[in-house]
């Protein structure tokens, strides 16, 4: 949950308000209470945003882009509150807003700078392309341009590919990293400096497991304490890589504490889940269960990927029958 907007106070009657795309914000303005209150909000000194005088709104010449998106705190005007409630901000709303307040006593003018940020939750994906393995950190919509950093075994990596596409109001960014043949752990951080919001993706490959047919395998998946906050909503998904694509075996939603299992041989330990341990068991292994198993723990602030490689070998009996 984020605040409606946050203010940064700067000198000369000017404040900076930071809002999020499509969310509501408040442009603050206060004055010394008095009678005969007149309030005019303008954008870039040209466009009429909102006018109030003689006890009511006068929106006849309001710029169409603000229609049905602005209101004042009418019960608070007599107490010196001229703040503007602004609905569903877009990146086109960025800029300088001027609040003119006139009363029987004085006239004051306040300036508010509105900055709008976008940060749709990023994702970290693990992909196989032919014989290569890639980690991809991507964010579908972000503004302003974020800072993306990669680390390998906690050491920053200078090589940082960024595929960027810009739309009218935000960027879409992919940052792929080739990790073919690597057993290292990787971390990708995407930071939106305006919204002061950081997302981290972490990828860990576990040692390969060799199992015999008909046995069961236990695969560990425990969140790293640095990122994990049990109070925050998150989702855990176990998937298996089959011919280049992942199929979901099971998932768990923390908000509802629901577990959905798509593979009858898959089991989760409820006791362990309550202790934030999402390790799983797969029973009665067969040869086709060989492959990569991915545990994905995701929230708004992080994605933790754990990869297990399982090799299922024929049992002695099966081998002797052949």
């Amino acid at each position: 949950i984020f605040p409606l907007a946050f203010f940064i106070y700067v000198p000369m009657n000017e404040q900076i308000v930071i809002g999020r795309l499509d969310e509501d914000i408040i442009l603050p303005s206060s004055f010394e209470r008095g009678s005969e209150v007149v309030i005019h909000w303008k954008y870039q000194d040209s466009y009429k945003v909102h006018s109030y005088y003689k006890g009511s709104d006068h929106l006849e010449s309001q710029d169409p882009r603000y229609a049905n998106r602005t209101s004042l705190f009418y019960n608070e005007i007599q107490n010196g509150n001229a703040s503007l409630f602004f609905r569903r901000v877009s990146l086109l709303d960025e800029g300088i807003y001027t609040c003119y307040v006139g009363t029987a006593i004085q006239v004051i003018t306040n300036k508010v700078v509105l900055k709008v940020g976008v940060f749709l939750t990023p994702v970290m994906k693990y992909e196989k392309r032919n014989t290569n393995s890639f980690l991809i950190c991507s964010v579908l919509s972000v503004y302003p341009r974020p800072i993306i950093t990669w680390k390998m075994d906690n050491t920053p990596i200078s090589e940082n590919n960024m595929e960027e596409t810009g739309s009218l109001d935000s960027f879409s960014i992919n940052s792929p990293l080739n990790i073919t043949g690597s057993n290292s752990s990787y971390e990708c951080t995407i930071e939106n400096s305006l919204l002061k919001q950081t997302w981290t993706g972490r990828w860990t490959m576990k040692d390969g497991l060799h199992k015999m047919q008909s046995e069961h395998v236990s695969l560990s998946c425990q969140p790293v304490n640095d990122y994990f906050s049990p109070n925050q909503d998150f989702k855990v998904t176990w998937s298996r890589m089959k011919s280049g694509t992942f199929s979901v075996l099971a998932y768990y939603l923390s908000s509802s504490q629901n577990t959905i299992i798509n593979e009858s041989r898959f089991s989760w330990n409820k006791e362990l889940i309550n202790q934030s341990d999402f390790s799983m068991n797969l029973m009665d292994l067969n040869l086709s269960d060989s492959g990569e198993y991915l545990c994905n723990i995701s929230s708004d602030e992080y994605t933790l990927l754990t990869i297990h490689t399982v090799h299922v070998e024929p049992s002695q009996e099966t081998a002797s029958h052949n």
Epitope: G55, G102, V107, T109
Partner: antibody
């Protein structure tokens, strides 16, 4: 102290033009709406026009709409009234008057001393 | 346009008298009414705004009342300096309109 000084009045023939000016001092001119109000000799007061503090809005009385144009120069603290197609009934003392605030309130807190316009053939 | 009608047109009173001037609007103007005083050869001066609010610097013997369509200006104790013409003005909507004026004479 607040001062409004009108100038530009005089005698003019019907159908001709005249430009009145109002010089403001003693307050932040760009914060206030300014009106023109006129008074025919021996008659009552008649509101003529208003221009808002930022020049964004201008309103006129029906009797002058289309003939008179109000304007302001906030950098020079001056207000103007361009009067075209003048009629005998436009003869009056023309006052510039400051609004309570932006121009939206519509009453007159400070007045100039007035300038006389006489339209006569 | 909203018509404003003042009565009486002329009023003669003595120093110390309580004087009342009435103003009627042709339609409701809430409390958006101002009163002005104009002395001979001078510009008008604001006395009252919003029907009953006394403008700063105006003597307290002046008061206003009313709302809707009926308004009054009262001078509680007439002074020689109050010789003037008094105008009401509605500022509910454009075009702003004045009453025809009430000329106050001192007996």
């Amino acid at each position: 102290q607040v001062q409004l000084v009108e100038s530009g009045g005089g005698v003019v023939q019907p159908g001709r033009s005249l430009r009145l000016s109002c010089a403001a001092s003693g307050f932040t001119f760009s914060d206030y709406g300014i009106h023109w109000v006129r008074q025919a000799p021996g008659k009552g007061l008649e509101w003529v026009a208003v221009i808002w503090y930022d020049g964004s809005d201008k309103y006129y009385a029906d009797s002058v709409r289309g003939r008179f144009t109000i304007s302001r120069d906030n950098s020079k603290n001056t207000l103007s009234l361009q009067m075209n197609s003048l009629r005998v009934e436009d003869t009056a003392v023309y006052y510039c008057a400051r609004d309570r605030s932006s121009g939206a309130m519509g009453y007159f807190v400070y007045w100039g001393q007035g300038t006389l316009v006489t339209v006569s053939s | 346009d909203i018509q404003m009608t003042q009565s009486p047109s002329t009023l003669s009173a003595s120093v110390g008298d309580r004087v009342t001037i009435t103003c009627r609007a042709s339609q409701s103007i809430s409390s958006w009414l101002a009163w002005y005083q104009q002395k001979p050869g001078k510009a008008p001066k604001l006395l009252i705004y919003k029907a009953s609010s006394l403008e700063s610097g105006v003597p307290s013997r002046f008061s206003g009342s009313g709302s809707g369509t009926e308004f009054t200006l009262t001078i509680s104790s007439l002074q020689p300096d109050d010789l003037a013409t008094y105008y009401c003005q509605q500022y509910q909507s454009y075009s702003y309109t004045f009453g025809q004026g009430t000329k106050l004479e001192i007996k």
